[in-house]
C-alpha cells in the first residue's frame, strides 16, 4: 500500500478548492446566459474502471495543473480577487504535491504505467477549448464567470475517479 494518504488529503484539498472557486464569483451566472458554452468535459475518462492507480493520479494531476495554468495567466489576475487567487494557487499547488508524492511511490508497484495517453489528451483538449473560448470572448467578465462555473463542474466530475482511488487504497 502507499505511504501517502492520497484520498483524505486530496478530498480535503478538493473541497477547499471548490469553496474558493465558489467564493471567487463576481457576477451572477444568470446575467451571462447568452455566453453559455458546452466545453464537452471528457466525463468518460473519469467514469471507467480501466485505470491503474498511477494512471488515475496522472489524470487528476492533469486537471489540477491545467486549472492552475488557466488561473495563473496575466488575464486571470486582472479578472479575479488577488487574495482569493493566491489561496487558490496554494490549494492547487498542495494537491499537485500530494499527487506527485503518491505517484512517485506508485510507479514502483509492479512497474505500473504512468499514463493513459488518450485520457491525458482528452483533458488537454478540454482545457484548450476553454482557453480558446476565453480568447474569442476577449476575456470578458461573463466569459470568466462561465469558465469559473465550468471548472467547478469539472472538479465535481473528477470526484468519481477520486472515489475509486479511495477504494483501491
Amino acid at each position: 500500500s502507499l505511504d501517502c494518504d492520497l484520498p483524505q488529503t486530496h478530498s480535503l484539498g478538493h473541497r477547499r478548492t471548490m469553496m474558493l472557486l465558489a467564493q471567487m464569483r463576481r457576477i451572477s451566472l444568470f446575467s451571462c446566459l447568452k455566453d453559455r458554452h458546452d466545453f464537452r468535459f471528457p466525463q468518460e475518462e473519469f467514469d471507467g474502471n480501466q485505470f491503474q492507480k498511477a494512471e488515475a493520479i496522472s489524470v487528476l494531476h492533469e486537471v489540477i495543473q491545467q486549472t492552475f495554468n488557466l488561473f495563473s495567466t496575466k488575464d486571470s489576475s486582472v479578472a479575479w480577487d488577488e487574495r482569493l487567487l493566491d489561496k487558490l494557487y496554494t490549494e492547487l499547488y498542495q494537491q499537485l504535491n500530494d499527487l506527485e508524492a503518491c505517484v512517485m511511490q506508485e510507479v514502483w508497484v509492479g512497474g505500473t504505467p504512468l499514463m493513459n495517453e488518450d485520457s491525458i489528451l482528452a483533458v488537454r483538449k478540454y482545457f484548450q477549448r476553454i482557453t480558446l473560448y476565453l480568447t474569442e470572448k476577449k476575456y470578458s467578465p461573463c466569459a470568466w464567470e462561465v469558465v469559473r462555473a465550468e471548472i467547478m463542474r469539472s472538479f465535481s466530475s473528477s470526484r468519481n475517479l477520486q472515489e475509486r482511488l479511495r477504494r483501491k487504497e
Epitope: 495554468n69 488561473f71 494557487y89 499547488y93 512517485m104
Partner: antibody, heavy 126, light 110 residues
C-alpha cells in the same frame, strides 16, 4: 515555446554577493517552477534551486542552503538568483531553466528542463 | 541522496557508428523520472529524452533511451557530425524536489 533571457556577465570579489536575473517570455505560466542550474568551467551541471512564481515557494539544493535566495516577479515573469559569500569555486555559468507545459503527462513536466537561458557567466576573482 | 554515474567519461567514435552511453543510479529511479540532455561547446543544454524513453520535440529518432531501476542507457544508432557533444542524464525525486545530474559523457570524433 518559452524564451529565457538572463542578465549579463559579472565579475565579483570573494565574500560579496551576486544577483542574476532571468526574464521569461512566450508561452509562460507562473504555475510552473523556474530553476537555476550552474556549470563551473569544464565541469558538469549542478541544480541549485527553484521557485514557483505564482506563490513564491522555493526549494534549494542542500549544498547552497544558507547562501542562496531565489525570488520572482509574476509580471513580467522574471526569476532572480542571489548567491552570497561568494568563493572562487562559485565561478561558473549560471543558467535558468524551466519545464514545458507541452510535456505529456503534466506530472512529468516539472521533473525536467525543456527550456534554458543562454547562461550568465559569474567570475569570482580578487 | 541519489548519485548518478555516467560511463564512459569519453567515447571516441566516427560518424556513422553507433553509441551507447550508460547512466547508473546509486538507488532505484523510476524510468519516468530519468531525462537526457545534449550540450555542445558554448551552448546551453538541450532536452533530448524524458520519461526514460520519450523523445523531446525535434529530436531525431536515431536517439533512444532505455533502462530501468538503476541502469539506464542513451543509444545513438548512427552518429551524425552534429551529434558530437557532452550528454548528461538527470533524475528527479520528490518530496522535497531534488534534481540530480550525472557528470556527463563526452562523445568526440575519433
Amino acid at each position: 515555446e518559452v524564451q529565457l533571457l538572463e542578465s549579463g556577465a559579472e565579475v565579483k570579489r570573494p565574500g560579496s554577493s551576486v544577483r542574476v536575473s532571468c526574464r521569461a517570455s512566450g508561452d509562460t505560466f507562473s504555475s510552473y517552477p523556474i530553476s537555476w542550474v550552474r556549470q563551473a568551467p569544464g565541469q558538469g551541471l549542478e541544480w541549485m534551486g527553484r521557485i514557483l512564481p505564482a506563490l513564491g515557494v522555493t526549494n534549494y539544493a542542500q549544498n547552497f542552503r544558507g547562501r542562496i535566495t531565489i525570488t520572482a516577479d509574476k509580471s513580467p515573469l522574471t526569476a532572480y538568483l542571489e548567491l552570497s559569500s561568494l568563493r572562487f569555486e562559485d565561478t561558473a555559468v549560471y543558467y535558468c531553466a524551466s519545464p514545458s507545459a507541452d510535456i505529456i503527462p503534466s506530472i512529468l513536466g516539472t521533473t525536467l528542463f525543456a527550456f534554458w537561458g543562454q547562461g550568465s557567466l559569474v567570475t569570482v576573482s580578487s | 541522496e541519489i548519485v548518478l554515474t555516467q560511463s564512459p567519461g569519453t567515447l571516441s567514435l566516427s560518424p556513422g557508428e553507433g553509441a551507447t552511453l550508460s547512466c547508473r543510479a546509486s538507488q532505484n529511479v523510476s524510468r519516468h523520472y530519468l531525462t537526457w540532455y545534449q550540450q555542445k561547446p558554448g551552448q546551453s543544454p538541450r532536452l533530448l529524452i524524458y520519461g526514460g524513453s520519450s523523445r523531446a520535440t525535434g529530436v531525431p529518432d536515431r536517439f533512444s533511451g532505455g533502462g530501468s531501476g538503476t541502469d539506464f542507457t542513451l543509444t545513438i544508432s548512427r552518429l551524425e557530425p552534429e551529434d558530437f557533444a557532452v550528454f548528461y542524464c538527470q533524475s528527479y525525486h520528490s518530496p522535497p524536489p531534488v534534481y540530480t545530474f550525472g557528470q556527463g559523457t563526452k562523445v568526440e570524433i575519433k
